[in-house]
Interface confidence: low
């Protein structure tokens, strides 16, 4: 489909005659008539099997034609075509008198022909017009003409059908060809199809609106390559979806069991050693000096006692001092210049002379010690923590540092060993002499129930339409990873498609 | 301009047959792609049925698969349904419709359709 314009632009009849050489009068009040036809070689009257087109009275004599396409005027004159365009064609354009106003043919006399001009050839469809002048003996018309397209058809012969869109059945323009040009972020035979944001997985990302990435079940992330864990997973990831793998110093079926609580909370005070011994246990090895569970405790050099003869003990930065009582001098005061007669013992002690009065002992009463009986008796001598707990003197009380295994004030009860919960997977654990025993329940085997040994819940292949099956170790069923399409806890469903049209 | 013309519809008894045409014209018939398409009172649009521009490419839903048969006549600009062991529930206006591309996806023109009731 395509239209063949003509541009009349002059007319030249000097002497305002007619073809038969009679004058017009008052002068030629001139029309035009065209006839478009296929090509013949000599063009001869007949059908203009392409179209016609008559003009109004455009001049008087000689006149120049005025380009009237602007104002929706008749010049270019327009002869459309609904057919493939031949790349040839006839040409008749006559120049006529008209005495009145009545242009029909048959209103007109016979003679009132002015000039009539005949061409053919070849014209290949383009936006440039071809300027002509036919002369005759009494009359010359300079024109152009050209064949373009109608709206929405391209190609050489305008017969490719293309019209430009963006909406659901494709998002195009129109290459000069008629061949499709896709609209940014849209590709396809017809542009139907968004290009998703760039990095998105081919796989586990669609989209439905160009630059997105929408994620397929059991995918995360902007680009959809990020797999989602399995629900309840707290420290573990996944390599495909719905799985948990646990981080380094985690445990448990969902990656929430402590494995290492020394480096995620570093419990130990003062520079202490760390070790873990299961989950959510770790033991202190204290730097000199320091002491308690997580050596938190700061051992001063003086709860030793180092200072004799009731001397009093002074905490240093670098040690300790002892401040001597009157008649006794050393490190740690143990020199005495004092006798029996000087009455060094106290709390009731009795003075006993050595060395001829160049010494002396006291004999202290129970409950107190020391050599000037200055003292009272240290409580953990009497060893009171009991299954190897460590006694530590605390002032006027002591408390007992009890062995793992043991509890209590000194370390007299028995830690169950099964306080630690060390069976796994609901097993029942009982209490023995010298250790426990797990009773596991049914689909578990191992010392501590650790073995799995129930059959794989996939092994029936219960899931449908080529989908993913994942067994969940935490209740022994399965999970179905459906593909696109499909839905249902099996993927049994295909998901509706447009609820309209489905093709 | 598009035009869709509908014709065939009428009355036919369950099991019966009938052959429903689509008349084109206003563009150039081998360039889109033709379909069907029905509406049964008080119910969603239920696309039935779509050839491809050439011809090479059919489309079933699966309620008439291996009853209806549809096919093409570029001599006469025409799409043709054959309509096999029709049911009651076939009973509906069955409109032809293009999408205005080549391939069969979604509709752009129709027509005014035709009728088709199944009952005895």
């Known amino acids: 489909s395509g239209v063949f314009q003509l541009q009349l632009q002059e007319f030249i009849n000097e002497r305002g005659v007619l073809a038969s050489g009679r004058p017009c009068e008052p002068g030629c009040r001139t029309f035009f008539r065209v006839c478009l036809k296929h090509f013949q070689a000599v063009v001869s009257p007949g059908p203009c099997t392409f179209g016609t087109v008559s003009t109004p009275v455009l001049g008087t004599n000689s006149f120049a034609v005025r380009d009237d396409s602007s104002g929706g005027g008749r010049n270019p004159l327009q002869l459309p075509f609904n057919f493939t365009w031949p790349g040839t064609f006839s040409l008749i354009i006559e120049a006529w008198h008209a005495p009145g106003d009545d242009l029909r043919p048959e209103a007109l006399p016979p003679d009132a022909l002015i000039s009539k001009i005949a061409i053919q050839g070849s014209l290949a469809v383009g936006q440039n017009w071809l300027l002509d002048e036919q002369t005759s003996t009494l009359t010359r018309l300079r024109y152009s003409y050209r064949v373009i397209c109608s709206d929405n058809y391209y190609g050489d012969n305008c017969s490719r059908l293309c019209k430009k869109r963006n909406d659901h059945f494709g998002h195009y323009v129109c290459q000069p060809d008629g061949n499709l040009s896709c609209l940014p972020g849209w590709t396809g035979e017809y542009c139907q199809q968004p290009i998703c944001l760039s990095g998105c997985h081919e796989q586990n990302g669609y989209c439905s609106k160009p630059a997105e990435c929408l994620c397929r079940p059991g995918w995360q992330g902007r680009l959809c390559n990020e797999c989602i864990p399995h629900n309840g997973c707290r420290h573990g990831t996944c390599s495909t979806p719905w799985q948990c793998t646990c981080d380094e110093g985690w445990g448990g079926l969902f990656c929430d069991q402590d494995l290492n609580y020394c480096t995620h909370h570093s419990p130990c005070k003062n520079g202490a050693t760390c070790s873990n011994s299961g989950q959510r246990s770790y033991t202190c090895t204290c730097r000199p000096g320091y002491t308690g569970v997580d050596c938190e405790l700061e051992l001063s050099e003086c709860d030793s006692n180092p200072c004799r003869n009731g001397g009093s003990c002074k905490d240093q930065e670098d040690g300790y001092h002892c401040l001597c009582p009157p008649g006794y001098y050393g490190l740690h005061c143990e020199h005495s210049t004092l006798s029996c007669a000087d009455s060094p013992c106290f709390n009731g002690g009795s003075c006993r002379e050595r060395n001829q009065g160049a010494n002396y002992a006291c004999e202290c009463p129970p409950n107190f010690t020391g050599s000037n009986c200055e003292k009272k008796v240290d409580r953990c001598t009497s060893n009171p923590c009991a299954n190897g707990g460590q006694c530590l003197n605390r002032g006027p009380s002591r408390m007992c540092r009890c062995r793992p295994g043991f509890t209590g004030t000194y370390c007299e009860l028995h830690v169950s060993d099964c306080a630690r919960n060390p069976c796994a997977h609901g097993g029942t654990c009982h209490d023995l002499e010298n250790g426990l025993m797990c009773t596991c329940p049914a689909g578990f085997s191992g010392r501590r129930c650790e073995v799995r040994t129930s059959i794989d819940a996939c092994a029936s292949s219960p899931c449908f339409n080529r989908a993913t099956c994942y067994t969940d170790l935490s209740t022994d069923t399965f999970v179905c990873n459906c593909p696109y399409g499909f839905v249902g806890s099996r993927c049994e469903f295909p998901v509706g498609l447009p609820p309209s049209f489905p093709w | 301009e598009v035009q869709l013309v509908e014709s065939g519809g009428g009355l036919v008894q369950p099991g019966g047959s009938l052959r429903l045409s689509c008349t084109a014209s206003g563009f150039t018939f081998d360039v889109y792609a033709i379909g069907w398409f029905r509406q049964a009172p008080g119910k969603e649009p239920e696309g039935i049925s779509c050839?491809?521009?050439?011809?090479?490419?059919?489309y079933y839903a699966d309620s008439v698969k291996g009853r209806f048969t549809i096919s093409r006549d570029s001599a006469k600009n025409t799409v043709y349904l054959q309509m096999n062991s029709l049911k009651p529930e076939d009973t509906a206006v069955y409109y032809c419709?293009?999408?205005?591309?080549?391939?069969?996806?979604?509709?752009?023109?129709w027509g005014q359709g035709t009728q088709v009731t199944v009952s005895s």
């Open positions: 050839i491809s521009s050439s011809g090479s490419i059919t």
């Open positions: 419709a293009t999408p205005g591309i080549a391939a069969c996806r979604g509709i752009h023109y």
